[in-house]
């Protein structure tokens, strides 16, 4: 399964779009979860509206917002006020009963605001990339190739 690498600036918003087959996933709720380890569980952050027909309505948990365009087959997750602690590996999921199908794996990287002199601590700033672009990363390509996914405010 592809891994999408997305970079966002601390304090700004990062929008993640996961596309899927609208017919195959008809009637299924979507979720955004954080993968906590190699084989560990994917911890649910937020999921779409309990009533599938209302999935277009924005659902929020803290600073994370999810909304699903079920006709277009696109679920959009917005991470607002991005913080260093938001960096990590996430999944877009399609829910079917108790089972969850992974639609996309998303690696979120948080870039430190160069004007902020505070200690970055656990913040990881990739040396080879100064732009805020993300890249569609197949298991055969590296960062900063292919399609760009600029973060939005």
């Amino acid at each position: 399964l592809n891994t999408t690498v997305l970079q966002g600036m601390a304090g700004q918003s990062l929008r993640v779009s996961c596309t899927y087959d609208a017919l195959k996933h008809w009637g299924r709720r979507k979720a955004w979860c954080r993968q906590l380890g190699e084989e560990g569980p994917c911890q649910r952050v937020v999921s779409t509206h309990g009533v599938w027909l209302l999935a277009f309505l924005k659902k929020r948990n803290g600073s994370t917002v999810i909304a699903d365009d079920t006709l277009a087959g696109t679920v959009t997750i917005t991470l607002k006020n991005l913080q260093a602690g938001d960096a990590g590996l996430y999944q877009c999921q399609s829910l079917r009963g108790r089972e969850a199908e992974v639609l996309q794996k998303v690696l979120v990287e948080v870039l430190e605001d160069p004007l902020d002199d505070q200690d970055a601590g656990d913040l990881w700033v990739p040396e080879e990339s100064s732009s805020f672009e993300g890249a569609q990363v197949e298991h055969s390509t590296s960062r900063n190739q292919e399609t760009s996914f600029p973060p939005t405010s």
Epitope: E39, A87, S142
Partner: antibody, heavy 122, light 105 residues
Framework: EVQLVESGGGLVQPKGSLKLSCAAS????????MNWVRQAPGKGLEWIAR??????????YYADSVKDRFTCSRDDSENMFYLQLSSLKTEDTAMYYC?????????????WGTGTTVTVSS | NVLTQSPALMSASPGEKVTMTCSAS?????MYWYQQKPRSSPKPWIY???ILASGVPARFSGSGSGTSYSLTISSMEAEDAATYYC?????????FGGGTKLVIK
């Protein structure tokens, strides 16, 4: 800066004991799993021990080659990670590396120390 | 879970494409790669199968799934001469491959 610094290596006789230390800085140490990896002279890398974070009950894991002889522990208040080596054998002679991997937000990003040398010889 | 790297030793000329493989005896979620040069500690090189670690040149790439993984250098440079190790963090014991030593022709 994220950093791991090992210490405590040295020359020890067979059947002897030694305690290695790893000082961590620049990251939220208490949220990460920590590991020891060693490399015998001219040989490849061998993972030997792991301790998980408090939220994972400080679970420990060992390679068969060191089980019941080596013990790893941690002190989250001091950002320290340890490896107690006992009943040492000549084949334990190696460079010992402290490695961060697992449990934290960036569980997939490894951080390695520069290593400390252990020589087991009579 | 045994990781087998091949070849154990390989040489390449500057500009040449290089591919080394890592085969796992049972399926793993991700593969990790490290670069090590003489008298230096290993450097994380590729994580989560295909993501380049900070500072790694874009000529490197990683790929694979299940039991078969590879590291590729699109155009060999002198500074790439080193030993490369693969590792799986999926299952205890967290095994390493035996390494592929890459030398410059």
């Amino acid at each position: 800066e994220v950093q791991l610094v090992e210490s405590g290596g040295g020359l020890v006789q067979p059947k002897g004991s030694l305690k290695l230390s790893c000082a961590a800085s620049g990251f939220s140490f208490n949220t990460y799993a920590m590991n020891w990896v060693r490399q015998a002279p001219g040989k490849g890398l061998e993972w030997i021990a792991r301790i998980r974070s408090k939220s994972n009950n400080y679970a420990t894991y060992y390679a068969d080659s060191v089980k019941d002889r080596f013990t790893c522990s941690r002190d989250d208040s001091e950002n320290m990670f340890y490896l107690q080596l006992s009943s040492l054998k000549t084949e334990d002679t190696a460079m010992y590396y402290c490695v961060r991997h697992g449990d934290g937000n960036l569980w997939y990003i490894d951080v390695w120390g520069t290593g400390t040398t252990v020589t087991v010889s009579s | 879970n045994v990781l087998t790297q091949s070849p154990a030793l390989m040489s390449a000329s500057p500009g040449e494409k290089v591919t080394m493989t890592c085969s796992a005896s049972s399926s793993v979620s991700y593969m990790y790669w490290y670069q090590q040069k003489p008298r230096s500690s290993p450097k994380p090189w590729i994580y989560l199968t295909s993501i380049l670690a900070s500072g790694v040149p874009a000529r490197f790439s990683g790929s694979g799934s299940g039991t078969s993984y590879s590291l590729t250098i699109s155009s060999m440079e002198a500074e790439d001469a080193a030993t490369y190790y693969c590792q799986q963090w999926s299952f205890n014991p967290y095994t390493f491959g035996g390494g592929t030593k890459l030398v410059i022709k």
